[in-house]
């Protein structure tokens, strides 16, 4: 008799999960050798042992703590670069201001961008089929709870100025929901953090409006400002032009407003 | 079985660029990180630079940065390594080359190389 | 960058003879060396990983040791098939270095 299996909502586990984890795990040690201690096989088994054999609707950061111990990492705490909706350019961004961090410039980060996984009550089986979707089925699936333990453990660790990345083409510039808005925000800690700064990406050529006076980057000002951290906003009009800028930044069209 | 298939020899120009693509087959090309490395006539080799084809992020050796650019075609699993500005001493063999993950991080596999002549 | 001097840049040795390549290192790169033999017009063929540790299908003649700044190729009896160059190779830090290699040729 086939076995029932539940049928979630989202798209199942990335195909070669197990191989693709440990693979850019060991990718991530060869290009940073301050991180060669670690033991690749350790860490997929953390992984592995976070949603393997749990129902995949009921996992918990404590799930993922064994795996935050092995990938415990230490960033310039005044380097780090967070982003909302616009991932794309802020990994651009730190290729080329190689002192940045993203989140996804971290090990830990690395090793699960941009993939999906769960498993299945009761059996070691990975499921390839289908995983929980966080509006239609549940919050506290593994891919969800994962990055929300990431993302906060990485906002914890941000001090002095911390930088972020907004995308401007968006209606809501600022998404409270977002992971930025819901879990990074929140975390990051005033007695360590001095300043907040936004950056605005344009999306249109002609865009010229102040976007740094939208409804949402207000909201966003007002939370950080009861959270005791200061908060400044930039407009980035032309995003080709930032970056060509950050790689030759004595160009002489760079010192003109980007 | 694994194999690293270069592109042929060059002749180039002073000043010119070139560009030796490297395909790669028998694994996923987006598991390893891919190294290019240089030798020139009766000299040592000299590590150029790696791309990791995954995500197409790259390091260059300090002597390369502003002449080199490492890319990918992650559709056929090729990698490319463009010098501009060539000049007499950049005359030499060119190797792409990758670990095996359970050899440390020594370059297991190589390209059978392509040699790069820049004459005036 | 980190240096890698190899010694002798040249030796000369017959078939059965024990041989030592050795190779310094300007700082302490652990165990993070590689050594390689190349043949004329050939690619690098990688010998010893991690200081001392047998690359896949590599004669068991051939041995590495050492750590932190001062490594041993040794080869305990020469075959006519080991007359080559080799090199050692530092991958504890980018970028990554080779010393300037060491030619056995046939006395």
């Known amino acids: 008799v086939p076995r029932w299996r539940q049928q979630w909502s989202g798209p199942g586990t990335t195909k070669r999960f197990p191989e693709t984890v440990l693979a850019r795990c060991v990718k991530y040690t060869e290009i940073h050798p301050e991180m060669r201690h670690v033991d690749c096989q350790s860490v997929w088994d953390a992984f592995k042992g976070a949603f393997i054999s749990k129902h995949p609707c009921n996992i918990t950061e404590e799930d993922y703590q064994p795996l935050m111990k092995l990938g415990t990492q230490t960033v310039p705490c005044n380097k780090i670069l967070l982003w909302s909706r616009i991932k794309d350019l802020a990994h651009q961004f730190t290729q080329v201001q190689r002192d940045m961090f993203t989140l996804e410039d971290t090990l830990l980060g690395y090793l699960a961008d941009d993939l999906t996984w769960c498993g299945e009550f009761n059996t070691s089986k990975i499921n390839y089929q289908s995983c929980p979707d966080w509006r239609k089925d549940c919050s506290n699936n593994p891919v969800s709870v994962f990055w929300k333990t990431v993302s906060r453990r990485f906002a914890e660790a941000a001090c002095d100025v911390v930088h972020v990345m907004l995308n401007g083409s968006r209606s809501k510039i600022f998404d409270k929901n977002s992971t930025f808005g819901s879990v990074e925000v929140h975390n990051l800690q005033p007695e360590k953090v001095q300043t907040l700064e936004a950056w605005v990406i344009h999306g249109g050529r002609e865009d010229s409006r102040d976007l740094c006076q939208d409804p949402t980057i207000k909201e966003l000002e007002s939370i950080i400002s009861k959270r005791n951290i200061q908060f400044s906003c930039k407009n980035i009009y032309r995003p080709d032009k930032f970056l060509q800028c950050v790689k030759n930044p004595e160009d002489s069209s760079c010192t003109s407003e980007i | 079985q694994m194999q690293l298939v270069q592109s042929g020899a060059e002749v180039k120009k002073t000043g010119s660029s070139v560009k030796v693509s490297c395909k790669a087959s028998?694994?996923?090309?987006?598991?390893?990180?891919m190294h290019w490395v240089r030798q020139a006539p009766g000299q040592a080799l000299e590590w150029m630079g790696w791309?990791?084809?995954?995500?197409?992020?790259?390091d260059y050796a300090q002597k390369f940065q502003d002449r080199v650019t490492i890319t990918r075609d992650r559709s056929m699993s090729t990698a490319y390594m463009e010098l501009s500005s060539l000049r007499s001493e950049d005359t030499a063999m060119y190797y792409c080359?990758?670990?095996?993950?359970?050899?440390?991080?020594?370059?297991?596999?190589w390209g059978q190389g392509t040699l790069v002549t820049v004459s005036s | 960058d980190i240096q890698m001097t190899q010694s002798p840049s040249s030796v000369s040795a017959s078939v059965g003879d024990r041989v030592t390549i050795t190779c310094r290192a300007s700082?302490?790169?652990?165990?993070?060396l590689a050594w390689y033999q190349q043949k004329p017009g050939k690619a690098p063929k990688l010998l010893i990983y991690?200081?001392?540790s047998l690359a896949d299908g590599v004669p068991s003649r051939f041995s590495g040791s050492g750590s932190g700044t001062d490594f041993t190729l040794t080869i305990s009896s020469l075959q006519p098939e080991d007359f080559a160059t080799y090199y050692c190779?530092?991958?504890?830090?980018?970028?990554?270095?080779f010393g300037q290699g060491t030619k056995l040729e046939i006395k």
């Open positions: 080359a990758r670990s095996a993950h359970t050899t440390g991080f020594g370059f297991a596999y």
């Open positions: 028998g694994y996923t090309f987006t598991d390893y990180i």
């Open positions: 791309i990791d084809p995954e995500y197409g992020r790259t």
């Open positions: 700082e302490d790169i652990y165990s993070n």
């Open positions: 991690d200081a001392n």
């Open positions: 190779q530092q991958y504890n830090n980018y970028p990554y270095t």
